[in-house]
Amino acid sequence: GITNINCSGHIWVEPATIFKMGMNISIYCQAAIKNCQPRKLHFYKNGIKERFQITRINKTTARLWYKNFLEPHASMYCTAECPKHFQETLICGKDISSGYPPDIPDEVTCVIYEYSGNMTCTWNAGKLTYIDTKYVVHVKSLETEEEQQYLTSSYINISTDSLQGGKKYLVWVQAANALGMEESKQLQIHLDDIVIPSAAVISRAETINATVPKTIIYWDSQTTIEKVSCEMRYKATTNQTWNVKEFDTNFTYVQQSEFYLEPNIKYVFQVRCQETGKRYWQPWSSPFFHKTPETVPQVTSKAFQHDTWNSGLTVASISTGHLTSDNRGD
């Protein structure tokens, strides 16, 4: 970067090289060039010469003042106009950054995706800081009192093999950058309560010719968890509102779910599951599209026929035999 150049003087920033976005800042440039009493000192920001708010302090030093500086990053350098020199002489350069101290991390969540071998912890980091912000995830066993710390820039995957202190833990997150430090509330977890079953996947759909045509959705999961509750949501692609069916599921065989749908309409289906009675759900599966026939013939849709889709649509909840409509956010 600009900081690696050979300097013939010194450039510095007040209050600091990393400062809070929106602050007024001063950049100082002091020349130390042999046989040069600078006629003028010039400042450049990202290669553009600055025209305004430059004040000469003394023979060798000038100040550039910025009001309400809002750029996350800028490369600054300054030059001198030396008598009898045709070109400006480079004095020095510095990269500057502006941003915010971290917010208190909240919504700390830790889950174990079945078969992953990891406990995945995530949190809401709050507003964008614009500057390098690190997170330390603290995991403390409630049985042994032993504490482990994990440094990361976003979420963290912790090997379940490293969680040797029993089943109960406290987890909290510390956020820190050059402008400040904050700590989340503590989350108490039990490893058995945070397992999310292996992903449920819709494999195919078929519409069977009958007096009232019926669509069967085939879906499955590789989970070994015995008691699993699932939700399937579906809607016509032109609709905003999801319909939701709930199931208590045993994945020893492929699931078949029946739906009575309007003819000649393109539908989208998604499924998600959780260990019955536990807190965390799987994310919704990839959208599965199926178009019902106009009238009689049998139509099959397979998983490889998926269109791409924004899966961040709307949510639902279910119990066997019930059909509900739900407009809640995910």
Epitope: P38, R39, K40, I48, K49, E50, R51, F52, I54, T55, R56, N58, K59, E81, P83
Partner: antibody
Framework: EVKLVESGGGLEQPKGSLKLSCTVS????????MSWVRQAPGKGLDLVAD??????????YYADSVKDRFTISADDSQSMVYLEMDNLKTEDTALYYC??????????WGQGVMVTVSS | DIQMTQSPASLSASLGETVSIECLAS??????LAWYQQKPGKSPQLLIY???SLQDGVPSRFSGSGSGTQYSLKINSLESEDAATYFC?????????FGGGTKLELK
């Protein structure tokens, strides 16, 4: 040879508008700043508006007395500089010079164009 | 903005004389000073820049000097064509600012 030719002056009523033009030739337009400097009758010289060179990203400056009323612009394809003057006041009456600056001192000047604001 | 105070406002001198015009800056301008000559009905012409550098084509009887806040323009052996108004300009800090002018008349 550097040449600057102003046009567009004249008599205008208070609150009226005028647009001054300056045709420039004989130098690299992008390497120089262009300014309008005015001289009220029997008075000194005042920088009114400035459009800086490419190295300054064409930053513009306006004297406090004309801020939000005057607009300086340049058309490098035509080698023209303009000064749009709105909401004119009697104190804007002056001879307006188009000038060129490479460093900050004004190296070249046009012949000037008279603007008279009177009811 | 830097203020430039020029003196005298006017002066009268004879052919062949030497005259000096002063310019005082409100703060150190580090030799970033230019001098202009404006003849009646004409646009200003650059005489001197960087306090003492003579612009091409300007007669050598014109010279500039000074440092810090005080600068002067000296005209040796006055000639009739030197009757004009002279302005100083600081370009140390933006925006550049002019002195009020000195009107030189020849007796």
């Amino acid at each position: 040879e550097v040449k600057l030719v102003e046009s567009g002056g004249g008599l205008e009523q208070p609150k009226g508008s005028l647009k001054l033009s300056c045709t420039v030739s004989g130098f690299d337009f992008n390497s120089y700043g262009m300014s309008w400097v005015r001289q009220a009758p029997g008075k000194g010289l005042d920088l009114v508006a400035d459009i800086n060179s490419k190295s300054y990203n064409y930053a513009t400056y306006y004297a406090d007395s004309v801020k939000d009323r005057f607009t300086i612009s340049a058309d490098d394809s035509q080698s023209m500089v303009y000064l749009e003057m709105d909401n004119l006041k009697t104190e804007d009456t002056a001879l307006y010079y188009c000038t060129v600056h490479h460093s900050d001192y004004f190296e070249y000047w046009g012949q000037g164009v008279m603007v008279t604001v009177s009811s | 903005d830097i203020q430039m105070t020029q003196s005298p406002a006017s002066l009268s001198a004879s052919l062949g004389e030497t005259v000096s015009i002063e310019c005082l800056a409100s703060e150190d301008i580090y030799n970033n000073l230019a001098w202009y000559q404006q003849k009646p009905g004409k646009s200003p012409q650059l005489l001197i820049y960087h306090a003492s550098s003579l612009q091409d084509g300007v007669p050598s009887r014109f010279s500039g000097s000074g440092s810090g806040t005080q600068y002067s323009l000296k005209i040796n052996s006055l000639e009739s064509e030197d009757a004009a108004t002279y302005f100083c300009l600081q370009d140390s800090e933006y925006p550049p600012t002019f002195g009020g002018g000195t009107k030189l008349e020849l007796k």
